[in-house]
Interface confidence: medium
């Protein structure tokens, strides 16, 4: 059954620099990522950015730099200046769009014991809507 | 208004293929996934497949496989579902059903074509 | 693929009575939708993702369950809920519907 892991880790030379990946495993062919902050998207959560395996990718700040890692994985690089700067206690939330399964998004922050460049393994995190 | 319009009542014969179509207005054709679902006279809801209008992909489901064919037309915004090498257990009503938008956050099947009666009979 | 089984086949209540649907999967899925079917007419989404209500869905239907055990249910029976409610799993190709459950008046 398809599932999607988020893993957030704090950079130990930009204490307010954060990187977010994520990955879908699942067989479907993915359509569309979404990656957000502060809940959900489209329920409360803010886009950060969309990447699209063959339309491209666009992002919006804090975002600094959104890349495929893999076919199914992607990293968002986001920057840690300015009031709309993520915190430690910052929820991302990912959404992978499959074809033809539907939407599966899941969501994490960063782990609070952890230290600065270190982080969670990616395991996968509870999923939120999934069809 | 959104809408799926299907195409009108068929009778085919045993061997024959049909092919139904699916007219979509009200809403941008390729940012929904169609999907076609299929109902024999007194049963239950299958599935045959899904087509992507975007990029036209298809995922069919393995009991149709190699009679299903599924395409898109974009400049008229219809779908068109073919069923060949048809038999009397094809005999059903035939639904499209708009699927899926990508800027949105649920995949949900929220608009149904009227459905089409497909009636195979020597 | 994975069958899902719907109890009762039939279930005979009154307006006004609560109204439980259950729906089993042969193994496990993340999500269940829940469709409604009136005679002659194509399906409508009530609940999608298991426990959200599809719009324009009144507030008296509601979805629950995990793993392979789901049910829909209707609070507080209206004239118009009399009619087929069907279960469907979009986890594992291919997707499928339960047979059927059909909400009779006694």
């Known amino acids: 059954t398809p599932e999607v892991w988020v893993q957030v880790r704090m950079e130990a030379t930009e204490l307010s620099s954060f990187t977010i990946r994520c990955g879908f495993l699942g067989s479907g062919s993915i359509s569309l990522v979404t990656v957000s902050w502060g809940g959900p998207n489209g329920a409360g959560g803010t886009t950060l950015a969309v990447l699209h395996p063959e339309r491209g990718i666009r992002q919006w700040a804090p975002a600094r730099q959104a890349r495929w890692e893999t076919q199914s994985s992607i990293s968002l690089i986001l920057e840690g200046s300015g009031a709309s700067s993520p915190c430690a206690n910052t929820t991302f939330c990912c959404k992978f769009a499959s074809f033809p399964e539907g939407s599966w998004e899941a969501c994490g922050s960063l782990p609070p014991s952890s230290d600065p460049g270190l982080s969670a393994p990616p395991t996968p995190a509870p999923i939120l809507r999934a069809d | 208004e959104v809408q799926l319009v299907q195409s009108g009542a068929e009778v085919k014969k045993p061997g024959a293929s049909v092919k139904v179509s699916c007219k979509a207005s009200g809403y941008t054709f390729t940012d929904y996934w169609i999907y076609w679902v299929r109902q024999a006279p007194g049963q239950g809801l299958e599935w045959m497949g899904t087509?992507?209008?975007?990029?036209?992909?298809?995922s069919y489901n393995q009991k149709f496989r190699g009679r299903v064919t599924m395409t898109r037309d974009t400049s008229t915004s219809t779908v068109y579902m073919e069923l060949s090498s048809l038999r009397s257990e094809d005999t059903a009503v035939y639904y499209c059903a708009r699927d899926f938008i990508i800027t949105v956050n649920y995949p949900v099947v929220d608009y149904w074509g009227q459905g089409t009666l497909v009636t195979v009979s020597s | 693929q994975i069958v899902l089984t719907q109890s009762p086949a039939t279930l005979s209540l009154s307006p006004g009575e609560r109204a439980t649907l259950s729906c089993s999967a042969g193994?496990?899925?993340?999500?269940m939708h829940w469709f409604q079917q009136k005679p002659g007419q194509a399906p409508r989404l009530l609940i999608y993702s298991t426990s959200n209500l599809a719009s324009g869905v009144p507030a008296r239907f509601s979805g629950s369950g995990s793993g392979t055990d789901y049910t829909l249910t209707i609070s507080s029976l209206e004239p118009e809920d009399f009619a087929v409610y069907y279960c469907?799993?979009?986890?594992?190709?291919?997707?499928?519907f339960g047979q059927g459950t059909k909400l009779e008046i006694k």
């Open positions: 193994s496990s899925v993340n999500y």
């Open positions: 469907q799993q979009r986890s594992s190709l291919p997707f499928t």
């Open positions: 087509i992507d209008t975007s990029d036209h992909k298809t």
